[in-house]
């Protein structure tokens, strides 16, 4: 036997108090799928949260964060404080990146500068709290007699057109 509630569309609920007829979701609630026996409470976007999308009878509200804060978690469940570039957020607030680390965003943690020597390269531009180091050519490439001319592009095989 088919469940009579399965006929209730999104935006309604199957009302047990009224012979299982489909009743519209009350204000401040929604059902995003059919066959629901209750409607879910709409999320409120207040305080540090702002409404990005209003709640409707078939979909929940969506929030984002007020300026100076950014979303964290599924569906922007939390708002975390922005920091400046060159800082990271700690339990005590925004703190400058330690020497040898950088953060080029308003969120996230300070990350170590790239170690150019691991790739056999030299440091072309020093790192700062806000920017990573820029690695240059390997020291061998900079030794006397090393050509600084860009090598020619490899020759194409005959009969092949450019990609």
């Amino acid at each position: 036997l088919q469940d009579p509630c399965s006929n209730c569309p999104a935006g309604t609920f199957c009302d047990n108090n009224r012979n299982q007829i489909c009743s519209p979701c009350p204000p401040n609630s929604f059902s995003s799928a059919g066959g629901q026996r209750t409607c879910d409470i709409c999320r409120q976007c207040k305080g540090v949260f702002r409404t990005r999308k209003e709640c409707s009878s078939t979909s929940n509200a969506e929030c984002d964060c007020t300026p100076g804060f950014h979303c964290l978690g599924a569906g922007c469940s939390m708002c975390e404080q922005d920091c400046k570039q060159g800082q990271e957020l700690t339990k005590k607030g925004c703190k400058d990146c330690c020497f040898g680390t950088f953060n080029d965003q308003k969120r996230g943690i300070c990350r170590p500068w790239t170690n150019c020597s691991l790739d056999g390269k030299s440091v072309l531009v020093n790192g700062t709290k806000e920017r990573d180091v820029v690695c240059g050519p390997s020291p061998a490439d900079l030794s006397p007699g090393a050509s600084s001319v860009t090598p020619p592009a490899p020759a194409r095989e005959p009969g092949h057109s450019p990609q």
Partner: antibody
Framework: QVQLQESGPGLVKPSETLSLTCTVS????????WSWIRQPPGKCLEWIGY???????NYNPSLKSRVNISVDTSQNQFSLKLNSLTAADTAVYYC????????????WGQGTTVTVSS | QSVLTQPPSASGTPGQRVTISCSGS????????VNWYQQFPGTAPKLLIY???QRPSGVPDRFSGSKSGTSASLAISGLQSEDEADYYC???????????FGCGTKLTVLG
């Protein structure tokens, strides 16, 4: 379950600053609003202000010039400072957790009585 | 002076149904859900109803809430002597970006 406990002086002199702390136990301070509410003897509940765990604050306009709320997530505490006290600030002061989905104050401290008198 | 308006007192006899009203404006009740709190003398308020009509676990189904326009009401059916307390309505106010309370209704259970 989550419990809140207010602490601070019971008696403060006029013109001085009241400092109260609310300690959150049995749960995290993250992802909620933390509010201060007061109730003068025989009178209404009055919202003082709130702080979101990540530092966002808002205050009752009638008290804004005198109030500061701060949070210490490492200690699971938040604090109230109210300056330039008068006898009208005599009240029971409550801290409360405000849910960040439906915004009901679902957990309250037991309250601390503050008397402003010389 | 509270932003939300409640009657200062209400009363009923055991078994009766009583309602407590709460009136606001478009910036609070008109645009936001209403919460209700119960407070016994010398204790902190307790959340009784949230989001207009939702009961936290442990709250008896004798308590119900509703909202229409810029007004809300709390209904208590099958009144019991232990329901004698103060009841406060509260709603977020968009102009404050914070909550506002009613001044409370003292419920007396007669007899």
């Amino acid at each position: 379950q989550v419990q809140l406990q207010e602490s601070g002086p019971g008696l403060v002199k006029p013109s001085e600053t009241l400092s109260l702390t609310c300690t959150v136990s049995g749960g995290s301070i993250s992802s909620y609003y933390w509010s201060w509410i007061r109730q003068p003897p025989g009178k209404c509940l009055e919202w003082i202000g709130y702080i979101y765990y990540s530092g966002y604050t808002n205050y009752n306009p009638s008290l804004k010039s005198r109030v500061n709320i701060s949070v210490d997530t490492s200690q699971n505490q938040f604090s109230l400072k109210l300056n330039s006290l008068t006898a009208a600030d005599t009240a029971v002061y409550y801290c409360a957790r405000t849910h960040s989905y439906y915004y009901g104050m679902d957990v309250w401290g037991q309250g601390t009585t503050v008397t402003v008198s010389s | 002076q509270s932003v939300l308006t409640q009657p200062p007192s209400a009363s009923g006899t055991p078994g009766q149904r009583v309602t407590i009203s709460c009136s606001g404006s478009s910036s609070n009740i008109g645009n936001n859900p209403v919460n209700w709190y119960q407070q016994f003398p010398g204790t902190a308020p307790k959340l009784l109803i949230y989001s207009n009509n939702q009961r936290p676990s442990g709250v008896p189904d004798r308590f119900s809430g509703s909202k229409s326009g810029t007004s809300a009401s709390l209904a208590i059916s099958g009144l019991q002597s232990e329901d004698e307390a103060d009841y406060y309505c509260e709603a977020w106010d968009d102009s404050l970006n914070g909550p506002v309370f009613g001044c409370g209704t003292k419920l007396t259970v007669l007899g």
